[in-house]
């Protein structure tokens, strides 16, 4: 396990509707690892999200990171967000830790989609 996972893209762009409930999956991110088997298994996490609005869970079957809405968003309040995600191997033997100190990161631009209120009669 001397290869660390690296994101395919330095920037991901996702959109979320302001009507989306918490827990909604708003998109996926993906890293690649040149190792095989369990040495290629990875874990995604949030490195930076000052708004604490999003979370990332790992799909261990596809090795994708799934970006999840943790708090409802409001277009009028904030119509875009930026979060930084990181990825690390799930299994790293002690003797190979030196190869894995710097986790690969990516930036995610998230655009909030406006949902017009229906007119009140």
């Amino acid at each position: 396990n001397d290869n660390k996972p690296i994101f395919k893209e330095s920037l991901y762009r996702l959109t979320v509707s302001e009507s989306a409930p918490t827990g909604t999956s708003i998109g996926t991110i993906m890293a690649y690892d040149n190792d095989i088997g369990e040495n290629a298994e990875m874990d995604y996490s949030i490195e930076e999200d000052d708004s604490q609005t999003f979370d990332i869970i790992t799909n261990h079957e596809t090795q994708e990171g799934i970006v999840i809405l943790k708090k409802k968003v409001d277009f009028e309040h904030q119509n875009h967000y930026g979060i930084r995600a990181k990825v690390k191997n799930h299994h790293v033997p002690e003797q190979l830790m030196k190869y894995h100190t710097e986790a690969s990161t990516t930036f995610i631009k998230i655009q909030v989609e406006d949902v017009d209120e229906p007119p009140v009669f």
């Epitope: 330095s10 920037l11 762009r13 959109t15 000052d50 708004s51 009028e76 309040h77 904030q78 119509n79 875009h80 930026g82 930036f107 655009q111 989609e113």
Partner: antibody, heavy 119, light 107 residues
Framework: QVQLVESGGGVVQPGGSLRLSCAAS????????MHWVRQAPGKGLEWVAV????????YYADSVKGRFTISRDTSKNTLYLQMNSLRAEDTAVYYC????????????WGQGTLVSVSS | EIVLTQSPGTLSLSPGERATLSCRAS???????LAWYQQRPGQAPRLLIY???SRATGIPDRFSGSGSGTDFTLTISSLEPEDFAVYYC????????FGQGTKVEIK
Amino acid sequence: QVQLVESGGGVVQPGGSLRLSCAASGFTFSSYDMHWVRQAPGKGLEWVAVISYDGTNEYYADSVKGRFTISRDTSKNTLYLQMNSLRAEDTAVYYCARERYFDWSFDYWGQGTLVSVSS
Amino acid sequence: EIVLTQSPGTLSLSPGERATLSCRASQSVSNTYLAWYQQRPGQAPRLLIYGASSRATGIPDRFSGSGSGTDFTLTISSLEPEDFAVYYCQQYSNSWTFGQGTKVEIK
């Protein structure tokens, strides 16, 4: 090097229409969100509209909503602003600007094109 | 809409002096999503600072930005002749709005 060149400005009567163009070069146009910003004579900057990198999302300032339309043609590396129902208060220099890749600030601007709405 | 108020309106200084420009937001600007631009007469604006404190490519280190929440500052440590211009702050926390500008003029 990155270059943005606006054209299409001119004098138009109130209620008239005009289409501005912004020719982009020196970067991968299809990877960047693009904006229009205007500046009335002797005044400050006012954001007008944005279009996403792939053209699927557009947003407008309230002052132009329903009258202006932003669009882009990736095959021509060109950004457009269709302005209808023009008013005297739309008189300004119109700049196109590129949004930073990892941010939402504007890292490159064109030289601007002047639109005068007058009878 | 987040309203940005810049002060002072005009700053009269001599080359070599330190300039301190202020930008106050009507509500908190998330994630320090604030930029500063310089506009010389007859020219387009130029990005100086983004993220409240990060210098844009090619910007001299005499320009620095600081602040968070609702109060932000642009400092020019020692004014050069080419620095006399109008400076705008911009927030991009929610949509995009600009301050009304501060003119830095030669005393």
